[in-house]
């Protein structure tokens, strides 16, 4: 019996087609993805093949103005229209709190939404009961397939799930649910979830009875053969893990942003064992037409967005590199721009001793979610900025000891190279890392811009001195693992909305051209 698994993950509000780098579509003939194009391809496969499941592995929420304005209602509407069979909860599904998940998505979705390792407690338990499930058994042709969900246990550090949801260890939580499916005589089981490729592989290895793992969160691109676009494969598709009980378990992920549709063919024997698996992500490029009915619906929903955000704020004459490939690995000019805007927003000339009360900015690279292409006449709109900074956070003022800052910069590179979000972009700071040294001892130089000076210059960080720093509220609250900031900050004052800070700066400057200028170096 052959099953076709179509899968998406980390779509992040890319309902409309995008440019190749998943930013706003500029040249329509070269654009990719979007739900109208996805629907065309999904429907073609459903027509041509007998046993097809369409699954999403989480993080539909957050990423463009669509989410800013519609707050998840767009996700439910268009996923319903595409007839998704199941979705796993991702960490970003909690960005607007539990209410922001329940009302627009959980109550409106016509497909099961899954997570086995999220347990509700207190008053929330009865309110959310039945709105998401640990697993669902789906009929597919003449057979049944069990889908069991999971969500990153790091979600409390990455989003806003509140205090009434407990995120358990994925493997510990999944095993009893899979065992339950086995007792129900379900012998074909897919683990669908949002914890990242490393956890996906562990689930494949450790959870007895899981036949296939469909993942997300790490934006992992897997491919067998010559890849069709710019993404470099992290491994073959499917990635085969040998389980502890000796089975070959295919693990898949489909990059992110709706650029690809994961396509996996699984052949099962009569006992539900995987005989073979093969496939590849399908690049949703312009050779695939956008479905007219879905496109018309998108255009109808789009009207509200156009009114919201299409006015020009200013211009850029350089590419604003907000790609994760840059901002999570090295200094990126989008990070520099945002930090400069954050400092600019906090210019308060107090007295003759200080040119300003604050000179330093830190910004988690993972919070920069999109580049901006200067080739669209250089125009920058609120909508463009909402794709870069989609989380609706604030840029806050904190006071920290130098020793806390040093810890933060060590944390920035403690697991460097895994495309994780904690890599810091900076302003008013010069940092040098030596990655040959062990984690926790990689910062070899950390100079900070003086404030008590008439001509600003860089001086070595003093461990016992108290510094003011502008940073996202996400970091002030210990997000991305920056627990030391939350635990050790001496003062915290809430600031202005992130997009507004940057948009005001761009409007003030009129024309911008941020550079990569040696703020972050590697020795």
């Amino acid at each position: 019996w052959e099953l076709t698994i179509l899968h998406t993950n980390d779509v992040h509000s890319r309902l409309e087609q995008t440019s190749e780098d998943s930013s706003k579509c500029v040249n329509a003939s070269r654009c990719m993805g979007g739900v109208a194009r996805l629907f065309t391809k999904v429907q073609q496969i459903r027509r041509a093949e007998p046993n097809v499941l369409l699954l999403d592995a989480g993080d539909q929420y957050q990423g463009t103005i669509w989410f800013t304005v519609y707050k998840g209602a767009e996700v439910a509407h268009f996923m319903n229209a595409l007839r998704y069979d199941a979705m796993a909860l991702g960490n970003h599904e909690f960005d607007n709190g539990v209410e922001g998940l329940i009302e627009p998505l959980l109550k409106e979705a016509k497909f099961p939404i899954l997570s086995a390792n999220i347990k509700a407690k207190g008053p929330l338990a009865s309110q959310i009961s039945g709105l998401y499930l640990p697993y669902k058994v789906l009929p597919v042709g003449d057979e049944v397939v069990g889908i069991v969900g999971y969500t990153s246990k790091e979600t409390p550090f990455l989003s806003n799930p509140g205090t009434n949801l407990v995120f358990e260890d994925e493997i510990t939580a999944l095993q009893p649910e899979v065992d339950k499916l086995k007792t129900l005589n379900v012998n074909k089981i897919i683990a669908l979830g949002h914890s990242g490729f490393e956890t996906d592989k562990l689930i494949a290895q450790k959870v007895r009875g899981v036949d296939v793992v469909v993942g997300g969160h790490s934006n992992t691109f897997l491919y067998t053969g010559n890849p069709p676009s710019k993404e470099v494969p992290a491994g073959k598709y499917p990635f085969i893990v040998t389980s502890d009980d000796g089975r070959k378990v295919p693990v898949v992920q489909a990059y992110a942003f709706g650029k690809y549709l994961g396509y996996l063919k699984i052949e099962f024997d009569e006992r539900g064992n995987v005989i073979s698996s093969h496939g590849n992500p399908i690049l949703l490029n312009s050779s695939i037409p956008e479905d007219p009915s879905i496109k018309a619906d998108i255009n109808k929903w789009r009207i509200k967005l156009d009114n919201y955000s299409t006015q020009e704020l200013g211009k850029t004459i350089v590419y604003l590199d907000g790609s994760s490939q840059s901002c999570r690995f090295r200094e990126c000019n989008m990070g520099n721009l945002i930090c400069d805007a954050m400092i600019n927003n906090n210019l308060r000339h107090a007295d003759e001793m200080f040119w300003n009360h604050v000179s330093m900015c830190i910004l988690n690279g993972g919070g920069i979610r999109s580049p901006i292409d200067e080739r669209n006449n250089g125009t920058i709109t609120w909508e463009n900025l909402a794709a870069v900074l989609p989380f609706g956070g604030t840029f806050d003022l904190v006071q920290l000891k130098g020793s806390t800052l040093k810890k933060a910069f060590e944390h920035s590179v403690h697991r460097y190279g895994q495309s994780t979000g904690e890599f810091l972009q900076v302003g008013g700071i010069h940092v040098v890392y030596d990655l040959s040294r062990k984690p926790g001892d990689r910062v070899v130089k950390l100079d900070v811009l003086c404030t008590k000076c008439r001509v600003p210059s860089y001086d070595p960080l003093k461990m016992d001195e108290i510094y003011k720093v502008i940073l996202p509220n996400f970091l002030a609250n210990g997000g991305d693992g920056f627990q030391m900031i939350k635990d050790e900050l001496l003062r915290h004052d809430s600031g202005d909305q992130d997009i507004n800070v940057v948009s005001t700066y761009i409007s003030k400057m009129k024309v911008i051209y941020p550079a990569v200028e040696g703020r972050i170096k590697f020795s």
Partner: antibody, heavy 123, light 113 residues
Framework: EVKLVESGGGLVQPGGSLRLSCAAS????????MSWVRQPPGKALEWLGF??????????EYSASVKGRFTISRDNSQSILYLQMNALRPEDSATYYC??????????????WGTGTTVTVSS | DIVMSQSPSSLAVSVGEKVTMTCKSS????????????LAWYQQKPGQSPKLLIY???TRESGVPDRFTGSGSGTDFTLTLSSVKAEDLAVYYC?????????FGSGTKLEIK
């Protein structure tokens, strides 16, 4: 000029193997779905399978009659399509055609055909 | 699998006559999303490779004479030659490309009297 030229046919014993090649020219090979179709002497055409284009992942589909025995592959750098045939049976004797499907989405008919190469499976 | 049935299996006509051959599919080839019929017609002359004549049930391939016309929808399709020429001597095959495996009809052999 768009052209497909098959080669590699011949006489093979039952249970044997053969690899057919199809050299493509005159078009951007990577953009097209490519299929193999066969025709036993005096009989109808039979689709054997296809390999998708690069954007669609170069994955394959097969008819039940050859699945597990035949493998379609492509060398995009040399614009060559292959059909690896294993465990051949007398009923696999036929003229084998390499075909192209148009580049446009969902157009899975065959707009270009090769001249064919003959495979005879006999002891 | 979708089964394609062609009739008649052969027919003999004189030059200049109109000829009609039919193709029936075991399930509808009309796709509701785009209102297209996933059916093609091919011509195979003696000793030659097949050649595409018609696709989407009624769209003539570039260079095909306008005496060839495809029609029909759903499960019933027709290929019509309005005025047969001697060079039309061939076997004509229909093919569905609605779903895998793609399947051909058994062919209609057109002979010239």
């Amino acid at each position: 000029e768009v052209k497909l030229v098959e080669s590699g046919g011949g006489l093979v014993q039952p249970g044997g193997s053969l690899r057919l090649s199809c050299a493509a020219s005159g078009f951007t090979f990577t953009d097209y779905y490519m299929s193999w179709v066969r025709q036993p002497p005096g009989k109808a055409l039979e689709w054997l399978g296809f390999i998708r284009n690069k954007a669609d992942g170069s994955t394959t589909e097969y008819s039940a009659s050859v699945k597990g025995r035949f493998t379609i592959s492509r060398d995009n750098s040399q614009s060559i399509l292959y059909l690896q045939m294993n465990a051949l049976r007398p009923e696999d004797s036929a003229t084998y055609y390499c075909t192209r499907s148009p580049i446009y989405f969902d157009n899975w008919y065959f707009d270009v055909w090769g001249t064919g190469t003959t495979v005879t499976v006999s002891s | 699998d979708i089964v394609m049935s062609q009739s008649p299996s052969s027919l003999a006509v004189s030059v200049g006559e109109k000829v009609t051959m039919t193709c029936k599919s075991s399930q509808s080839l009309l796709y509701s999303n785009n209102q297209k019929n996933y059916l093609a017609w091919y011509q195979q002359k003696p000793g030659q490779s097949p050649k595409l004549l018609i696709y989407w049930a009624s769209t003539r391939e570039s260079g095909v004479p306008d005496r060839f016309t495809g029609s029909g929808s759903g499960t019933d399709f027709t290929l019509t030659l309005s005025s047969v020429k001697a060079e039309d001597l061939a076997v004509y095959y229909c093919q569905q490309y609605y779903s895998y495996p793609f399947t051909f009809g058994s062919g209609t052999k057109l002979e010239i009297k």
